[in-house]
């Protein structure tokens, strides 16, 4: 068409997909009467009439725009609804009078792509591949026009680099006219890239300006051979017998090699393989002093049959041996002295403490306990505690019982027991002394003796309450080589006036405390005797 080259540049109208484009016919009054205008769409240089304006009234032409066009602004503006990517073209309005003039509008359509979806290569990448390998794929769906992709590694943009970095992008057009972009990042990675964070960024334009969307960050599995193997022990710090100890083999390769953990046999000096659990961890539970020694880890790279050895690691399981006390079973006369000596072995320096068993009172800090002017009350338990101050919880103890020679000592001298006639009494009597006494009763009945400890005895007597017994009472006598001693039990008949308010049973129970370091009791229990058979 002659003179077409002098046409002014079309007016640019930018709009997002799905919204309404307002196409304002920019003809001046001198160029044409806006009450008589034809609208055309231009696609591949072919004009198609899409809308007529006559006397200010609009009429759509049949075709793709038939349902989406309307007049606005007293006929000066054509509104195109539900814009699609296919609407990106030139629209022109042509005035008919006074002479044929036209005004061109370039419609630009935009659509932000969806969030980019990044997929890492699940198979991973070996470090010494000869050419770039696929690291990840980035997909940006439904954008218009085609967005630009930028790949990042650790926050820095990646550039194409021969034999090192290659970015391969392609796009497909959806039926909607929108574009889906796929970009594959290929790279040659090094061992240090095992923790590298990769992501892709889509850059796109909207009427409001330039925008971008970032994918999530991903790391790619990087495979590299093991160069170093080492052992790690948990817990860290001083170990003691009884602890749960884990020895694990670690390597700087990926995937980890096949491991074995060995301990050096101290006598043969051979490395003997230890049995590890399914995770390749050697668990010592409970740890014993025999677990101390030299451990090492061997790793095999089965791809090359290369075997690697860790530096040996010395493991020390600290211990305290059984505690020995001498003399082991001390016996002393009243008024004499005694020296108790405590011994133990340990992998560390030991501290000793002597405690009184009954009270937990600390008597001495050190391995030797000296006792002077021994009284009967000094008899009983003494505990030696051997502990390692630098390792809390590492200690062993040994109890020794001191016996003081002396005649029997009764738990009580005398006491009252409430009874009923014809009941079977269960009487008990306790005595202590060294040598341990024996107990006898002054009445007939069923007696049984029970040793409470090396110096203490408890005798129990079952006896029927008779009028004679009520009169005489019961005596128990304890005797040993050094003398004898007696306790008396007075029997008192129960009647309604002697029953206490809370006595709702026919059993009266009486307890007496007599010994300075033992508790003793005497009980009476009623048992009804069978009634005589009635004779007919």
């Amino acid at each position: 068409v002659p003179g077409e080259a002098e046409q002014p540049a079309p007016e640019l109208v930018e709009v997002e997909v799905g919204s309404t484009a307002l196409l304002k016919c920019g003809l001046s009054q001198s160029q044409g009467n806006l009450s008589h205008v034809d609208w055309f769409s231009v696609h591949k240089e072919k004009r198609t009439l899409i809308f007529r304006v006559r006397q200010g009234q609009g009429q759509s032409e049949p075709g793709e725009y038939e349902q989406r066009l309307s007049l606005q602004d007293r006929g000066a503006t054509l509104a195109l609804t539900q814009v699609t990517p296919q609407d990106e073209r030139i629209f022109l309005c042509q005035g008919k009078r006074p002479r044929s003039q036209e005004y061109r509008i370039q419609l630009r359509v935009y659509k932000a792509p969806e969030e980019p979806n990044i997929q890492v290569n699940p198979l991973g990448i070996p470090v010494n591949s000869k050419e770039p390998e696929e690291v990840a794929t980035c997909v940006g769906r439904n954008g218009y026009p085609i967005p630009q992709v930028i790949w990042y590694k650790n926050g820095r943009p990646l550039k194409e680099e021969k034999n090192r970095v290659h970015i391969q992008s392609s796009q497909t057009v959806e039926s909607s006219g929108l574009y889906t972009l796929q970009s594959i990042l290929k790279a040659q990675l090094v061992k240090e890239d095992k923790d590298a964070q990769f992501y892709c960024e889509l850059n796109y334009r909207l009427p409001s300006g330039n925008h971008m969307k970032e994918s999530r960050e991903v790391t790619v599995p990087v495979f590299y051979p093991t160069e170093k193997v080492w052992l790690e022990v948990e817990p860290v710090g001083m170990l003691k017998e009884g602890d749960r100890v884990e020895i694990r083999c670690l390597a700087d390769g990926n995937p980890p090699p096949h491991f074995s953990i060995s301990k050096q046999n101290p006598s043969t000096r051979e490395a003997e393989e230890e049995t590890t659990n399914d995770n390749g961890v050697l668990v010592l539970e409970p740890a014993r002093k025999e677990h101390s020694g030299r451990y090492e880890c061997q790793a095999w790279n089965l791809d090359t049959m290369i075997s690697l050895l860790s530096e040996p690691q010395e493991l020390l399981v600290n211990y305290v041996s059984d505690v020995r006390v001498s003399p082991a079973a001390p016996e002393r006369q009243e008024g004499s002295s005694l020296t108790l000596t405590c011994e133990a072995e340990s992998s560390q320096d030991l501290e000793f403490q002597w405690l009184r068993e009954e009270t937990d009172q600390v008597l001495e800090r050190g391995p030797v306990l000296q006792l002077h002017d021994l009284k009967r009350e000094a008899g009983g338990g003494y505990r030696c505690v051997a502990s390692v101050p630098s390792i809390p919880g590492l200690n062993r103890t040994q109890l020794v019982k001191l016996a003081i020679f002396g005649p029997p000592w009764m738990a009580f001298k005398e006491r009252k027991v409430w009874v009923k006639e014809n009941m079977v009494l269960n009487l008990s009597c306790e005595a202590s002394g060294h040598p341990r006494p024996t107990i006898s009763w002054n009445v007939n009945g069923t007696a049984s003796e029970q040793d409470q400890d090396p110096q203490r005895v408890l005798s129990t007597l079952n006896v029927l309450v008779t009028p004679e017994l009520l009169e005489t009472g019961v005596e128990c006598t304890a005797s040993n080589d050094l003398g004898k001693n007696t306790s008396i039990l007075f029997l008192e008949l129960v009647n309604l006036t002697t029953l206490t308010p809370d006595s709702n049973t026919t059993t009266g129970l009486s307890t007496s405390t007599a010994s300075p370091h033992t508790r003793a009791n005497s009980t009476s229990t009623e048992r009804k005797l069978p009634e005589p058979e009635s004779r007919g």
């Epitope: 070996p126 490395a271 003997e272 791809d303 090359t304 049959m305 290369i306």
Partner: antibody, heavy 120, light 112 residues
């Protein structure tokens, strides 16, 4: 018959580079672990590098780590040793070797060797 | 690193005589689980490349004459040629593969 033929040796100045090649035939090259072993003028043998059958795993002793690179092209049945920052102590006869299918690292087959001399 | 020490460094033996070469490792090469030692022996005849003789300390490579035998365990190993033949003149090397790979310095066998 297993055949390993080394090439690429020669005289090179200290600090220089050299690339050795080993052409393999008579076996399925891509199935075997390959290594380079060198022999010094004093007749000492020293392992130099090992590569897995697929080429993804490589190993070196500390004496050459970071200076030598072993690689392979299974399509061409060829093993390579790229040597850089060469030192006089790298002077040796370099042998290309093939492992065997034992559960232990052995150099079952050896080439005839190629001589590398590092000297100014 | 594991150091391999061979002794003697050379020896001259009459044909038909027994030859014993020792190899000592700076640490045990025994894998206690499989009860095998990571030790191999190689032979290098004059002007030739080395050749594998024995692996696992005592297993002969196929084609190796039975006059060659390997023994020992842990740190001390021996290569024995029961009756020296003229074609056995060579340098013999031991090699460990317990931790990476190291060779002994070699033992030269000559005919007296």
């Amino acid at each position: 018959e297993v055949k390993l033929v080394e090439s690429g040796g020669g005289l090179v100045q200290p600090g220089g580079s050299l690339r050795l090649s080993c052409a393999a035939s008579g076996f399925t090259f891509s199935s075997y672990i390959m290594s380079w072993v060198r022999q010094t003028p004093e007749k000492r043998l020293e392992w130099v590098a090992t590569i897995s059958s697929g080429g993804s795993s490589t190993y070196y002793p500390d004496s050459v780590k970071g200076r030598f690179t072993i690689s392979r092209d299974n399509a061409k049945n060829t093993l390579y040793l790229q040597m850089s920052s060469l030192k006089s102590e790298d002077t040796a006869m370099y042998y290309c070797t093939r492992d065997d299918d034992y559960d232990v690292k052995v150099f079952a087959y050896w080439g005839q060797g190629t001589l590398v001399t590092v000297s100014s | 690193d594991i150091v391999m020490t061979q002794s003697p460094s050379s020896l001259a033996v009459s044909l038909g005589e027994r030859v014993t070469i020792n190899c000592k490792s700076s640490r045990s090469l025994l894998n206690s689980r499989i009860r095998k030692n990571y030790l191999a022996w190689y032979q290098q005849k004059p002007g030739q490349s080395p050749k594998l003789l024995i692996y696992w300390a005592s297993t002969r490579e196929s084609g190796v004459p039975d006059r060659f035998s390997g023994s020992g365990s842990g740190t001390d190993f021996t290569l024995t040629i029961s009756s020296l033949q003229a074609e056995d003149v060579a340098v013999y090397y031991c090699k460990q593969s317990y931790n990476l790979l190291t060779f002994g310095q070699g033992t030269k066998v000559e005919i007296k």
